[in-house]
Amino acid sequence: QGGTRSPRCDCAGDFHKKIGLFCCRGCPAGHYLKAPCTEPCGNSTCLVCPQDTFLAWENHHNSECARCQACDEQASQVALENCSAVADTRCGCKPGWFVECQVSQCVSSSPFYCQPCLDCGALHRHTRLLCSRRDTDCGTCLPGFYEHGDGCVSCPTSTLGSCPERCAAVCGWRQMF
């Protein structure tokens, strides 16, 4: 006697969510929900995210896209990957620079700035790494320099300069002055 029943949709699982009267399918990544479905378990009306916005999730029910982040030029950040409809901008540092956390307690999502890699040559040391952060990451003293304290000191150019034992060994002095 009763008419035919609508297909059952219990909103179970990730694909459906009750929006208005019915359980509706979600939108794909890169799209936002414009209008809910008009029948049980139906497709929602989804539109592509506008430029400079994105939604990375599949089967979602967001009614607006998230704004793409702008890399912080003041922090010397650059865009390693531009924003797309399905992914936010990926900010990082240009070659020859490294990421330094801006806060004292850091996790991978902490704000950061970019610092130039250390110039080991300017410290009169050999370069050991593609990007040194600290003088201890540099190598030994360059020819013509010897270890003194935490730094490299140039070999004396005449017998008037003092040349301690380590200096004598590196700089080739036969006697100490």
Partner: antibody, heavy 117, light 106 residues
């Protein structure tokens, strides 16, 4: 010769605390960044925490942030890891390591932490 | 986070054979990649850093290559002491390790 010796591991109940120590010799901890890395039984390596050479910045894996605290005592040339609110998934061998440009060039032999009721 | 995927999971070879281990990154890590060796009950040991530089005291039979997302560790001729687990690690963005490759005696 560079040497690192961890201690302080043991059996602890879920929710409990432990403090791991790493005594360094052959170098000065205040001149190098230092890390803790862990390895669950039969599993791979997982970076846990690090402290900068200046000691001014500390770094944590998302899984331990807010529960673990890395620190050092330069007078004792020792690195520490204070572990609070311990969970079963924190069960692992914990290694301390000296950093070389964000790589780990010297490691201790590790100390086993078991979290179980 | 950058995910490092190592292959194969296990490599069965005989002493004297050549071993080729792979590490693939989920996004470019430039050349900021290291390889470690770990034997049972021991701490890991740094073998290669910045993709291709041998660490102090590492024999010449170990070599690393690659950049961007694909990296290789090669052991030119396996010695009995080389049978172990090998891990790659990146320092491009935070710090992550691969899941490891076990090199076992066939």
């Amino acid at each position: 010769e560079v040497q690192l010796l961890e201690s302080g591991g043991g059996l602890v109940q879920p929710g409990g605390s432990l403090r791991l120590s790493c005594a360094a010799s052959g170098f000065t901890v205040s001149r190098y960044a230092m890390s803790w890395v862990r390895q669950a039984p039969g599993k791979g390596l997982e970076w846990v925490s690090a402290i900068s050479d200046s000691g001014g910045r500390t770094y944590y894996a998302d899984s331990v942030m807010g529960r673990f605290t890395i620190s050092r005592d330069t007078s004792k040339n020792t690195l520490y890891l204070q572990m609070n609110s311990l969970r079963a998934e924190d069960t692992a061998v914990y290694f301390c390591a000296k950093e070389f440009g964000d790589y780990l060039d010297y490691w201790g032999q590790g100390t086993l932490v078991t979290v179980s009721s | 986070e950058i995910v490092l995927t190592q292959s194969p999971a296990t490599l069965s070879l005989s002493p004297g054979e050549r071993a080729t281990l792979s590490c693939r990154a989920s996004q470019s890590v430039s050349s900021y990649l290291a390889w470690y060796q770990q034997k049972p009950g021991q701490a890991p040991r740094l073998l290669i850093y910045d993709a291709s530089n041998r660490a102090t005291g590492i024999p010449a039979r170990f070599s690393g290559s690659g950049s961007g997302t694909d990296f290789t560790l090669t052991i030119s001729s396996l010695e009995p002491e080389d049978f172990a687990v090998y891990y790659c690690q990146q320092r491009s963005n935070w710090w992550t390790f691969g899941q490891g490759t076990k090199v076992e005696i066939k």
